[in-house]
């Protein structure tokens, strides 16, 4: 097992991941691993110094940097808000706010926008992941009703009158429920026909 | 449009304590992260504490162990209690959320 640092004439290091080429001394040196960075530099004869990042910096991977990336805290006016908290070895995490989606990525969300409402009649297509894009609205399967203008609100199944021990006075639609009588009710004189034999 | 009302700054010796309060409106509140930011003379707005629909917190390093942030869902009001005060944490004290408008904030000045 040959141990860092060593020589290397092709320019590539047996373990990729954890070790790096040096060109000025053309050899393989070790990485430092992730919450940790290079406090001094490789030689021939010495490997990697590697220290502990601190407080409110990290490093996320195995590395050969001399300094820890800062921490950043995610920001409420930007729609962010934290899920787990920034540590040696992992940046801040953040997520959208409730009843929003990311509007804008670079490497990661840096700003936020509230998601669009869906119509009656329809509901926000479910997504595999939160937070990931705008609303997309799909009509109410049948039998089934949205009644306002919501981000979230979800398509309900029809009342059955019958379960209810009522007849059905309207039918439902994508937009409304079924609307229920007694069966005792009468008609309104609208919907009575006469039946002339 | 959310407006945002902060109260509760002062003039403080060095070593003291006072609870900034913010009052929100125009929001749905528990589902807002707010976050209390300042501006001392001269510099650039800066980003202190959040806190999250769930309650968890952060701190800038410079007021960690010595500032809690904090929520009162009910009451629509986000708090910032400041303990040891420092002359550095002289500024004016903003809260703010998602599409919130800037209010007038509230004057900490740390000074014997």
């Known amino acids: 097992q040959v141990v860092p640092p060593y020589g290397s004439e092709n320019q590539t290091c047996r373990d990729q991941e954890k070790e790096y080429y040096e060109p000025r001394h053309r050899i393989c040196c070790s990485r430092c691993p992730p919450g940790t960075y290079v406090s001094a530099k490789c030689s021939r004869s010495r490997d990697t110094v590697c220290a502990t990042c601190a407080e409110n910096s990290y490093n996320e991977h195995w590395n050969y940097l001399t300094i820890c990336q800062l921490c950043r805290p995610c920001d409420p006016v930007m729609g962010l808000e934290e899920i787990a908290p920034c540590t040696s070895k992992r940046k801040t995490q953040c997520r959208c706010q409730p009843g929003m989606f990311c509007a804008a990525w670079a490497l990661e969300c840096t700003h936020c926008e509230l998601l669009s409402d869906c119509p009656p009649g329809t509901e926000a297509e479910l997504k595999d992941e939160v937070g990931k894009g705008n609303n997309h609205c799909v009509p109410c399967k049948a039998g089934h009703f949205q009644n306002t203008s919501s981000p979230s609100a979800r398509c309900q199944p029809h009342t059955r009158c019958e379960d209810q021990g009522l007849v059905e006075a309207a039918p439902g639609t994508a937009q409304s429920d079924t609307t229920c009588r007694n069966p005792s009710e009468s008609l309104p004189p609208e919907m009575s026909g006469t039946m002339l034999m | 449009e959310v407006q945002l009302v902060e109260s509760g700054g002062g003039l403080v010796q060095p070593g003291g304590s006072l609870r900034l309060s913010c009052k929100a409106s125009?929001?749905?509140?528990?589902?807002?992260?707010f976050g209390w930011y300042r501006q001392a003379p001269g510099k650039q707005r800066e980003l202190v504490a959040t806190?999250?629909?769930?309650?968890?917190?952060w701190y800038d390093v410079s007021v960690k162990g010595r500032f809690i942030i904090s929520r009162d869902n009910p009451e629509n009001t986000v708090y910032l209690q400041m303990n040891s005060l420092r002359p550095e944490d002289t500024a004016v004290y903003y809260c703010?959320?998602?599409?919130?408008?800037w209010g007038q904030g509230t004057l900490v000045t740390v000074s014997s």
């Open positions: 806190i999250s629909t769930a309650g968890l917190t």
């Open positions: 703010n959320t998602f599409r919130g408008n």
């Open positions: 125009g929001t749905t509140f528990s589902d807002r992260a």
